[in-house]
């Protein structure tokens, strides 16, 4: 977790931001949290992005002010409004675009002084696995899909009993490309499959790694999935 | 309260321009976009363009060629103009606000102002 | 575009009875579906905005429910004063949609 904190001159207020990222398509969060003052209209909260030259969002007495908003964040952002006087100056962007990553500032003021603080923000593309028994194989085989990966990640596949086992010889990987040119389905066949026995098929790339188990025995079949993004970072 | 209000011609010739003014209150529009929507009679609402907080603009593609939106900040006032007008334009514009600066829901519309494009 | 297709048409229903409205969207627009209220001779009112989320002063028995395509608007016990046009729309991408409506009779 990367935490950044930002203190600035000699009535200074303590500003704090996590690095996050992005899953391009839907909505995402920009965190900042800053020292609460007691007036909402002493407020003002200024989010700025390295390379661009208009605002990305401004709020201030106690309402948002969009005159100086860049054309790229038209429409898409919001602060949480009814949270800005407990110190929550955290960021609501609308259909995440690969464009949307870079370095961004949270800059307040507020009665009692001012701070800012970067924030890190990558976008990609990544969803839970989901790992099945492909019974249309001629052997016993598992099929591992992830409909929204980006960038390209890595896939491999490892098992319970053989731990340290190097499955990259008896398993295929494949990606296609979805329909909005961007992310690629991620799909992945396991041979030669043993029962009694727990797989895990490992998506990761920069920004996630995502995991789908599958304990396959005589009488059932269960499945895990989780999902980690990768560098959370605050400043 | 925030309010809308539309102002318009009711009746265009047709291939003639139409003009409308939303005049709102109760809030900015340099904190809000401002929507236009409209609804041919019997039918269903037709999502026309915006013009957001900044005074860009993004317009429906089947009528970008034809339709402008501006604003006065300080008269609280959008304007909206469509050219070359055609009998099947004749429907009850509408200016509408968000609920919130992310287009989540229109929350605030205005009474509407029917447009006839007839001859 | 993104189409919004709303089912049914039309329906007619009695007061106190449970009304279940559909609203299916051609591509995933994530949870931005927003659902109308028309009355005759009025502009559209908003009920629910974000898919679930009531707007202030609409009535607990209008509920939304839904992402990605498929989208509900529930009535719990329909009144009289529901009958109306209901409309979803969609503001994930331009342009924004809107679908054609459902017309609520009461019998």
């Known amino acids: 977790l990367i935490i950044g904190f930002g203190i600035s001159g000699r009535h200074s207020i303590t500003v704090t931001t996590v690095a996050s990222a992005g899953n391009i398509g839907e909505d995402g969060i920009l965190s900042c949290t800053f020292e609460p003052d007691i007036k909402l209209s002493d407020i003002v909260i200024q989010w700025l992005k390295e390379g661009v030259i208009g605002l990305v969002h401004e709020f201030k007495e106690g309402k948002d002010e969009l005159s100086e908003q860049d054309e790229m964040f038209r429409g898409r952002t919001a602060v949480f409004a009814d949270q800005v006087i407990v110190g929550n100056a955290s960021l609501r962007l609308k259909n995440v675009q690969l464009t949307d990553a870079g370095t961004y500032k949270c800059y307040i003021i507020t009665s009692k002084g001012k701070g800012n603080a970067n924030l890190e923000y990558k976008t990609g593309a990544f969803s839970m696995p989901e790992v099945n028994v492909d019974y249309n194989a001629s052997s016993e085989t598992l099929r591992c899909e992830a409909p929204r990966w980006f960038p390209q990640p890595t896939v491999v596949w490892a098992s319970q009993v053989d731990q340290g086992a190097n499955f990259s010889e008896v398993s295929n990987t494949s990606f296609e490309l979805n329909s909005e040119n961007v992310t690629m389905k991620v799909v992945s066949v396991l041979y030669n499959v043993t029962i009694n026995n727990t797989y895990s098929c490992m998506i990761e790339n920069d920004i996630a790694k995502a995991t789908g188990d599958i304990k396959v025995t005589e009488s059932e079949i269960k499945r895990r999935s989780h999902l980690q993004l990768l560098n959370s970072k605050a400043s | 309260q925030m309010q809308l209000q539309e102002s318009g011609p009711g009746l265009v010739q047709p291939s003639q321009s139409l003009s409308i003014t939303c005049t709102v209150s109760g809030f900015s529009l340099t904190s809000y976009g401002i929507h236009w929507v409209r609804q041919s009679p019997g039918k269903g609402l037709e999502w026309l363009g915006v013009i957001w907080s900044s005074g860009s603009t993004d317009y429906n593609a089947a009528f970008i060629s034809r339709l402008s939106i501006s604003k006065d900040n300080s008269k609280s006032q959008v304007f909206f103009k469509m050219n070359s007008l055609q009998s099947d334009d004749t429907a009850i514009h509408y200016c509408a606000r968000d609920i919130t600066t992310i287009a989540e829901g229109f929350a605030y519309w205005g009474q509407g102002t029917l447009v006839t494009v007839s001859s | 575009n993104i189409v919004m297709t709303q089912s049914p048409k039309s329906m007619s229903m009695s007061v106190g009875e449970r009304v279940t409205l559909s609203c299916k969207a051609s591509e995933n627009v994530g949870t931005y579906v927003s659902w109308y209220q028309q009355k005759p001779e009025q502009s559209p009112k908003l009920l629910i905005y974000g898919a679930s989320n009531r707007y202030t002063g609409v009535p607990d028995r209008f509920t939304g429910s839904g992402s990605a395509t498929d989208f509900t608007l529930t009535i719990s016990s329909v009144q009289a004063e529901d009958l109306a046009d209901y409309h979803c729309?969609?503001?994930?991408?331009?342009?924004?949609?809107f679908g054609s409506g459902t017309k609520l009779e009461i019998k």
């Open positions: 729309g969609q503001s994930y991408s331009y342009p924004f949609t």
